[in-house]
Protein backbone atom coordinates (compact mmCIF):
# COMPACT_ATOMS: atom_id res chain seq x y z
CA UNK A 1 0.00 0.00 0.00
CA UNK A 2 2.82 2.41 1.06
CA UNK A 3 4.64 1.67 -2.06
CA UNK A 4 1.77 2.45 -4.24
CA UNK A 5 0.78 5.62 -2.90
CA UNK A 6 4.50 6.67 -2.78
CA UNK A 7 4.29 5.77 -6.24
CA UNK A 8 1.06 8.30 -7.30
CA UNK A 9 1.86 11.01 -4.67
CA UNK A 10 5.31 11.63 -6.26
CA UNK A 11 3.75 12.90 -9.22
CA UNK A 12 2.17 15.66 -7.09
CA UNK A 13 4.96 18.39 -7.09
CA UNK A 14 2.65 20.91 -5.14
CA UNK A 15 3.51 20.10 -1.65
CA UNK A 16 -0.15 20.90 -0.93
CA UNK A 17 -1.56 18.44 -3.37
CA UNK A 18 0.66 15.63 -2.15
CA UNK A 19 -0.40 16.01 1.35
CA UNK A 20 -4.01 15.98 0.17
CA UNK A 21 -3.51 12.55 -1.17
CA UNK A 22 -1.89 11.24 1.40
CA UNK A 23 -5.26 12.24 4.01
CA UNK A 24 -6.99 9.99 1.17
CA UNK A 25 -5.04 7.09 2.65
CA UNK A 26 -6.14 7.69 6.48
CA UNK A 27 -8.90 5.05 7.13
CA UNK A 28 -12.61 6.45 7.75
CA UNK A 29 -14.60 3.34 7.93
CA UNK A 30 -17.69 5.78 8.21
CA UNK A 31 -17.51 7.64 5.17
CA UNK A 32 -17.05 6.67 1.31
CA UNK A 33 -14.12 8.52 -0.31
CA UNK A 34 -16.63 10.62 -2.11
CA UNK A 35 -18.74 12.09 1.20
CA UNK A 36 -15.17 12.75 2.25
CA UNK A 37 -13.87 14.30 -0.92
CA UNK A 38 -17.32 16.83 -0.90
CA UNK A 39 -15.94 18.42 2.47
CA UNK A 40 -12.54 19.69 0.53
CA UNK A 41 -12.64 23.46 -0.27
CA UNK A 42 -8.91 23.77 -1.23
CA UNK A 43 -9.60 23.35 -4.73
CA UNK A 44 -10.42 20.87 -7.21
CA UNK A 45 -6.77 19.85 -7.42
CA UNK A 46 -6.99 19.02 -3.75
CA UNK A 47 -9.87 16.74 -4.39
CA UNK A 48 -8.56 14.74 -7.46
CA UNK A 49 -5.58 14.05 -5.54
CA UNK A 50 -7.29 12.91 -2.30
CA UNK A 51 -9.95 10.94 -4.48
CA UNK A 52 -7.53 8.96 -6.26
CA UNK A 53 -5.52 8.46 -3.34
CA UNK A 54 -8.44 7.29 -0.99
CA UNK A 55 -10.11 5.22 -3.89
CA UNK A 56 -6.29 3.36 -4.70
CA UNK A 57 -6.01 2.79 -0.46
CA UNK A 58 -9.61 1.50 -0.29
CA UNK A 59 -9.18 -1.10 -2.99
CA UNK A 60 -5.96 -2.38 -2.15
CA UNK A 61 -6.94 -2.90 1.34
CA UNK A 62 -10.05 -4.56 0.44
CA UNK A 63 -7.56 -6.55 -1.78
CA UNK A 64 -5.52 -7.65 1.14
CA UNK A 65 -8.68 -8.52 3.45
CA UNK A 66 -9.97 -10.48 1.05
CA UNK A 67 -6.61 -12.18 0.81
CA UNK A 68 -6.47 -12.52 4.34
CA UNK A 69 -10.07 -14.69 4.08
CA UNK A 70 -8.71 -17.04 1.36
CA UNK A 71 -6.04 -17.98 3.34
CA UNK A 72 -8.38 -18.58 6.48
CA UNK A 73 -6.30 -16.18 8.49
CA UNK B 1 -15.52 41.53 -1.12
CA UNK B 2 -12.06 40.01 -0.73
CA UNK B 3 -9.15 42.31 1.02
CA UNK B 4 -5.52 41.27 2.38
CA UNK B 5 -4.67 44.50 4.41
CA UNK B 6 -0.95 44.15 5.52
CA UNK B 7 1.02 45.81 8.43
CA UNK B 8 3.06 48.91 8.14
CA UNK B 9 6.40 49.79 6.78
CA UNK B 10 9.15 48.92 9.04
CA UNK B 11 12.97 50.10 9.26
CA UNK B 12 15.46 47.62 10.82
CA UNK B 13 19.08 47.11 11.61
CA UNK B 14 21.38 43.96 10.06
CA UNK B 15 20.59 41.33 12.18
CA UNK B 16 17.32 41.55 13.35
CA UNK B 17 14.32 39.92 12.97
CA UNK B 18 10.93 41.20 11.15
CA UNK B 19 7.24 40.09 10.95
CA UNK B 20 4.95 41.03 8.81
CA UNK B 21 0.88 40.62 8.80
CA UNK B 22 -1.66 39.91 6.22
CA UNK B 23 -5.36 40.24 7.75
CA UNK B 24 -7.67 38.61 5.38
CA UNK B 25 -11.38 39.32 5.01
CA UNK B 26 -14.29 38.50 2.98
CA UNK B 27 -14.12 34.95 2.45
CA UNK B 28 -13.11 32.14 4.59
CA UNK B 29 -9.58 32.33 5.62
CA UNK B 30 -9.01 28.21 6.09
CA UNK B 31 -10.20 27.34 2.71
CA UNK B 32 -7.15 28.97 0.75
CA UNK B 33 -3.06 29.11 0.87
CA UNK B 34 -1.77 32.33 1.76
CA UNK B 35 1.90 32.66 0.07
CA UNK B 36 4.73 35.55 0.72
CA UNK B 37 6.46 36.48 -2.11
CA UNK B 38 9.27 39.93 -2.29
CA UNK B 39 10.04 42.58 -4.67
CA UNK B 40 13.70 44.24 -4.10
CA UNK B 41 13.81 47.77 -5.40
CA UNK B 42 13.73 47.58 -9.42
CA UNK B 43 13.37 43.62 -9.54
CA UNK B 44 11.66 41.16 -10.19
CA UNK B 45 9.28 38.94 -7.73
CA UNK B 46 10.86 36.45 -5.66
CA UNK B 47 8.48 33.31 -3.82
CA UNK B 48 9.40 32.92 -0.47
CA UNK B 49 6.72 30.50 0.68
CA UNK B 50 3.63 29.39 1.91
CA UNK B 51 0.86 28.47 4.40
CA UNK B 52 -2.40 25.91 4.33
CA UNK B 53 -3.72 27.50 7.28
CA UNK B 54 -6.25 25.30 7.80
CA UNK B 55 -4.08 22.34 8.15
CA UNK B 56 -0.93 24.95 9.21
CA UNK B 57 1.12 22.98 6.57
CA UNK B 58 4.23 25.11 5.20
CA UNK B 59 6.16 25.10 2.64
CA UNK B 60 9.54 27.56 1.88
CA UNK B 61 11.87 28.53 -0.52
CA UNK B 62 15.05 26.73 0.26
CA UNK B 63 17.11 30.20 -1.13
CA UNK B 64 15.71 31.61 2.07
CA UNK B 65 18.15 28.94 4.52
CA UNK B 66 15.72 28.74 7.14
CA UNK B 67 15.35 32.76 7.46
CA UNK B 68 11.63 32.84 7.13
CA UNK B 69 8.82 31.47 8.77
CA UNK B 70 4.99 31.58 7.97
CA UNK B 71 2.63 31.41 10.62
CA UNK B 72 -1.58 31.90 10.94
CA UNK B 73 -3.84 32.96 13.37
CA UNK B 74 -7.60 31.44 12.60
CA UNK B 75 -9.50 33.36 15.03
CA UNK B 76 -8.06 36.60 13.55
CA UNK B 77 -7.85 35.59 10.30
CA UNK B 78 -4.04 37.24 9.67
CA UNK B 79 -0.93 35.03 8.65
CA UNK B 80 2.21 36.48 9.22
CA UNK B 81 5.86 36.13 7.25
CA UNK B 82 8.73 36.73 9.92
CA UNK B 83 12.30 37.11 8.43
CA UNK B 84 15.01 36.64 10.39
CA UNK B 85 18.97 37.06 10.23
CA UNK B 86 18.42 40.43 8.37
CA UNK B 87 20.68 41.86 5.69
CA UNK B 88 20.76 44.77 3.15
CA UNK B 89 19.61 43.08 0.41
CA UNK B 90 16.56 41.97 2.45
CA UNK B 91 15.57 45.83 1.68
CA UNK B 92 12.14 44.84 -0.23
CA UNK B 93 8.50 45.15 -0.47
CA UNK B 94 6.87 42.17 0.75
CA UNK B 95 3.32 40.80 -0.50
CA UNK B 96 0.80 38.41 0.29
CA UNK B 97 -1.57 36.52 -1.81
CA UNK B 98 -4.42 34.49 -1.91
CA UNK B 99 -3.74 31.69 -3.79
CA UNK B 100 -7.05 30.07 -5.45
CA UNK B 101 -7.95 26.22 -6.34
CA UNK B 102 -4.06 25.79 -5.95
CA UNK B 103 -3.52 27.53 -8.96
CA UNK B 104 -2.89 31.24 -9.23
CA UNK B 105 -2.93 34.24 -7.22
CA UNK B 106 -6.13 36.30 -7.31
CA UNK B 107 -6.06 38.91 -4.46
CA UNK B 108 -2.76 40.40 -3.37
CA UNK B 109 -1.88 42.46 -0.23
CA UNK B 110 -0.68 46.17 -0.84
CA UNK B 111 2.72 45.26 0.41
CA UNK B 112 4.90 46.16 3.37
CA UNK B 113 8.10 48.04 2.80
CA UNK B 114 11.16 46.67 4.84
CA UNK B 115 14.19 48.49 4.57
CA UNK B 116 17.42 46.98 6.63
CA UNK B 117 19.71 49.83 7.12
CA UNK B 118 22.09 50.52 10.03
CA UNK C 1 13.07 24.39 -9.54
CA UNK C 2 11.03 25.36 -12.91
CA UNK C 3 13.05 28.72 -14.74
CA UNK C 4 10.98 30.65 -16.12
CA UNK C 5 12.51 32.90 -18.74
CA UNK C 6 10.93 35.66 -20.29
CA UNK C 7 11.84 37.67 -23.46
CA UNK C 8 12.04 40.79 -24.35
CA UNK C 9 12.97 41.82 -21.31
CA UNK C 10 11.22 45.27 -22.02
CA UNK C 11 9.46 46.30 -25.29
CA UNK C 12 8.27 49.81 -26.53
CA UNK C 13 4.63 49.63 -28.52
CA UNK C 14 2.69 51.91 -30.51
CA UNK C 15 -1.24 52.42 -29.39
CA UNK C 16 -2.93 50.12 -31.44
CA UNK C 17 0.22 48.26 -32.05
CA UNK C 18 -0.19 44.43 -30.62
CA UNK C 19 2.53 43.84 -28.48
CA UNK C 20 3.85 39.74 -27.50
CA UNK C 21 5.99 38.41 -24.63
CA UNK C 22 7.18 35.25 -24.21
CA UNK C 23 7.97 32.93 -21.36
CA UNK C 24 9.22 29.79 -21.36
CA UNK C 25 9.44 27.02 -18.69
CA UNK C 26 12.72 24.85 -18.13
CA UNK C 27 10.64 21.95 -17.70
CA UNK C 28 6.88 21.19 -18.47
CA UNK C 29 4.27 22.85 -16.39
CA UNK C 30 1.64 21.08 -17.31
CA UNK C 31 0.14 18.39 -15.55
CA UNK C 32 -2.37 15.71 -16.84
CA UNK C 33 -3.60 18.41 -19.87
CA UNK C 34 -3.75 21.01 -17.33
CA UNK C 35 -1.36 24.32 -17.89
CA UNK C 36 -0.38 25.64 -14.43
CA UNK C 37 0.89 28.79 -15.75
CA UNK C 38 0.04 32.15 -14.97
CA UNK C 39 0.67 36.02 -16.23
CA UNK C 40 0.18 39.10 -14.08
CA UNK C 41 0.45 43.23 -14.62
CA UNK C 42 2.08 45.41 -12.70
CA UNK C 43 2.30 49.05 -12.48
CA UNK C 44 4.34 51.39 -10.50
CA UNK C 45 4.04 50.93 -6.43
CA UNK C 46 0.68 48.71 -7.01
CA UNK C 47 0.95 44.47 -6.20
CA UNK C 48 0.62 42.56 -9.64
CA UNK C 49 -2.84 41.87 -10.55
CA UNK C 50 -3.78 38.62 -12.22
CA UNK C 51 -4.18 38.74 -15.66
CA UNK C 52 -4.43 35.01 -17.26
CA UNK C 53 -4.51 31.84 -15.45
CA UNK C 54 -4.09 28.14 -16.35
CA UNK C 55 -2.35 29.73 -19.72
CA UNK C 56 -5.24 31.31 -21.75
CA UNK C 57 -8.24 32.06 -19.20
CA UNK C 58 -8.79 35.34 -18.89
CA UNK C 59 -9.47 36.28 -15.49
CA UNK C 60 -12.68 38.69 -14.35
CA UNK C 61 -12.47 41.95 -15.39
CA UNK C 62 -9.40 41.99 -17.43
CA UNK C 63 -9.62 43.43 -20.70
CA UNK C 64 -10.68 41.19 -23.84
CA UNK C 65 -7.48 42.43 -25.80
CA UNK C 66 -5.08 40.43 -23.76
CA UNK C 67 -5.14 37.05 -24.74
CA UNK C 68 -2.79 33.79 -23.62
CA UNK C 69 -1.74 31.10 -25.35
CA UNK C 70 0.68 27.79 -24.83
CA UNK C 71 1.28 24.68 -23.14
CA UNK C 72 3.90 22.56 -21.89
CA UNK C 73 7.25 24.73 -21.77
CA UNK C 74 5.93 27.39 -24.26
CA UNK C 75 3.79 30.26 -23.42
CA UNK C 76 2.67 33.40 -25.23
CA UNK C 77 0.93 36.55 -23.54
CA UNK C 78 -0.73 39.35 -26.56
CA UNK C 79 -2.01 42.33 -25.99
CA UNK C 80 -3.60 43.30 -29.35
CA UNK C 81 -4.54 46.46 -29.52
CA UNK C 82 -1.94 47.82 -26.84
CA UNK C 83 -3.47 50.94 -25.22
CA UNK C 84 -1.53 53.65 -23.25
CA UNK C 85 -2.78 52.03 -19.85
CA UNK C 86 -0.64 48.88 -20.64
CA UNK C 87 2.21 50.00 -19.25
CA UNK C 88 3.42 48.43 -17.05
CA UNK C 89 5.74 44.96 -15.89
CA UNK C 90 4.17 41.83 -16.70
CA UNK C 91 5.42 38.32 -15.34
CA UNK C 92 4.49 34.94 -15.84
CA UNK C 93 4.53 32.13 -13.11
CA UNK C 94 4.06 28.80 -12.84
CA UNK C 95 2.13 26.68 -9.93
CA UNK C 96 2.94 23.18 -11.19
CA UNK C 97 5.47 22.59 -8.40
CA UNK C 98 7.23 23.93 -5.73
CA UNK C 99 8.91 26.24 -5.60
CA UNK C 100 6.53 28.43 -7.11
CA UNK C 101 8.78 30.90 -9.61
CA UNK C 102 7.97 33.83 -11.28
CA UNK C 103 10.00 35.10 -14.52
CA UNK C 104 12.28 37.74 -14.56
CA UNK C 105 9.31 40.20 -16.13
CA UNK C 106 9.01 42.52 -19.49
CA UNK C 107 8.66 45.91 -19.31
CA UNK C 108 6.11 47.10 -21.47
CA UNK C 109 6.45 50.94 -22.87
CA UNK C 110 4.32 52.83 -24.97
CA UNK C 111 5.58 54.90 -27.77
Known amino acids: LQEKIEEIAAKYKHLVVKKCCYDGVRINHDETCEQRAARISVGPRCVKAFTECCVVASQLRANNSHKDLQLGR | QVQLVQSGAEVKKPGSSVKVSCKAS????????IHWMRQAPGQGLEWMGY????????NYNENFKGRVTITADKSTSTAYMELSSLRSEDTAVYYC???????????WGQGTTVTVSS | DIVLTQSPASLAVSPGQRATITCKAS??????????MNWYQQKPGQPPKLLIYAASNLDSGVPARFSGSGSGTDFTLTINPVEAEDTANYYCQQSNEDPHTFGGGTKVEIK
Open chain 2, 97 to 107: ARERNLEYFDY
Open chain 2, 26 to 33: GYTFTDHI
Open chain 2, 51 to 58: IYPREGWT
Open chain 3, 27 to 36: QSVDFEGFNY
